[in-house]
Interface confidence: medium
């Protein structure tokens, strides 16, 4: 261990003063996994990058601390930095989708990815499939795959077709889908996270 802590510190030290301030404010409202508490506001706002890294690791441990940090960075629009953080903290697994090189590797987290855990619910409840397709197109979906999903007549069948490509995806590819879901149907993701 220790690698995740270093990666968190590296990410936070690369933020501008304004970005670090924004990071702390977002950290105060970001959804947390069940069983985890929130870092007290008073302590949080006065911390520098090093203190904040130590606090994140002590509150959330390294693995979840890194995941949480990456989520907040993504919420701030810093996708590249979030990807680098995750790539630095996890080994890759799974092949890239046909014709497309995988994004920076990040799999090997314990258990199933959110996308796999909630496959049935996502197939049944995602309504804005094409919004997702546009977010994934060129990144994890080839044109052929994109067209195949879009050709399906209903949202559930579109989602089923989309899921037919996910066995070849690594953790980061699945994170891209989760991020797109957060952007298009955040209430659904929050609902499933609570379930």
């Amino acid at each position: 261990m220790g690698r995740a802590r270093d990666a968190i510190l590296d990410a936070l030290e690369n933020l501008t003063a304004e970005e670090l301030k924004k990071f702390k404010l977002k950290l105060l409202s970001v959804p947390l996994r069940e069983g985890y508490g929130r870092i007290p506001r008073g302590a949080l706002l006065s911390m520098d990058a090093l203190d904040l890294t130590d606090k994140l690791v002590s509150f959330y441990l390294e693995t979840y601390g890194a995941e949480l940090t990456a989520n907040v960075l993504r919420d701030m629009g810093l996708q590249e930095m979030a990807g680098q953080l995750q790539a630095a903290t996890h080994q890759g697994s799974g092949a890239a989708p046909a014709g497309i090189q995988a994004p920076p590797q990040s799999a090997a987290k314990p258990g199933l990815h959110f996308i796999d855990q909630h496959r049935a619910a996502l197939i049944a409840r995602v309504t804005n499939v094409e919004w997702l397709l546009d977010a994934l197109y060129g990144k994890v979906l080839t044109d052929e795959q994109y067209q195949a999903v879009r050709a399906e007549p209903t949202n559930p069948s579109k989602m089923r077709k989309l899921f037919s490509f996910t066995p070849a995806w690594n953790w980061t590819c699945k994170d891209l889908l989760l991020q797109a879901l957060r952007e298009s149907q955040s209430y659904l993701v929050e609902d499933l996270e609570r379930s």
């Epitope: 629009g77 810093l78 996708q79 590249e80 014709g99 497309i100 090189q101 995988a102 994004p103 804005n128 499939v129 094409e130 919004w131 546009d134 977010a135 197109y137 060129g138 990144k139 080839t142 044109d143 067209q147 879009r150 007549p153």
Partner: antibody, heavy 118, light 111 residues
């Protein structure tokens, strides 16, 4: 502010090749694709192809498959288009543009004028 | 390839009146969710500028006098009321399937 800046005008000989650049700033470079579009003097727009810079994924219009090669350099947030075996038919303005959701082209560079002449 | 046919090729409209430009696709570019048709404005010596994306969504910073409509194969760009600065060539473009293609353009002149 999102900006795309293309390299300057080129005057080249028939049969040669040229490599033009499109430098981007103001957004996360790896999040969007960059498309290239050709416009001959006084004529309409032709879609050449695009590159998703995060992973180098490219798609080409069949018509330009043997003519254009798209590459990118993440470090400098720059996309390149190389055109080979140039003829007078390739004389045109070439635009790069950012590919956004729905694959509309939301930001365009000023264009690079290519003149192929002996 | 999907062929986009714009009409008219040119039109002259009086200041303050309505300009209507049509774009017809050789096959449908719409799904149940979106119509993958976009509209651009190009002035001499300048690159095109995106006005409308996904058939009817106005780009930020584009005046509300521009509007887009249509689905399937038939799409329309309306400008009302037309202003002096709207003199330009307008292009439709689809992104339904590869290759994405543009219409031939409609030149708008202000009388």
């Amino acid at each position: 502010e999102v900006q795309l800046q293309q390299s300057g005008a080129e005057l080249v000989r028939p049969g040669s090749s040229v490599k033009m650049s499109c430098r981007t700033s103001g957004y996360t470079f790896t999040n969007n694709g960059i498309t290239w579009v050709k416009q001959r003097p006084g004529q309409g727009l032709e879609w050449i192809g695009y590159i998703y810079v995060g992973n180098g994924y490219t798609e080409y219009n069949e018509k330009f498959k043997d003519k254009a090669t798209l590459t990118s350099d993440t470090a400098s947030s720059t996309v390149y288009m190389q055109l080979n075996s140039l003829t007078s038919e390739d004389s045109a303005i070439y635009f790069c543009a950012r590919l956004d959701r729905g694959r509309a082209l939301d930001y365009w560079a000023q264009g690079t004028t290519l003149t192929v002449s002996s | 390839d999907i062929v986009l046919t714009q009409s008219p090729a040119s039109l002259a409209v009086s200041l303050g009146q309505r300009a209507t430009i049509s774009c017809r696709a050789s096959k449908s570019v719409s799904s149940s969710a979106y119509s993958y048709m976009h509209w651009y404005q190009q002035k001499p010596g300048q690159p095109p500028k995106l006005l409308i994306h996904l058939a009817s969504n106005l780009e930020s910073g584009v005046p509300a006098r521009f509007s887009g409509s249509g689905s399937g194969t038939d799409f329309t760009l309306n400008i009302h009321p037309v202003e002096e600065e709207d003199a330009a060539t307008y292009y439709c473009q689809h992104s339904w399937e590869l290759p994405y293609t543009f219409g031939g353009g409609t030149k708008l002149e202000i009388k």
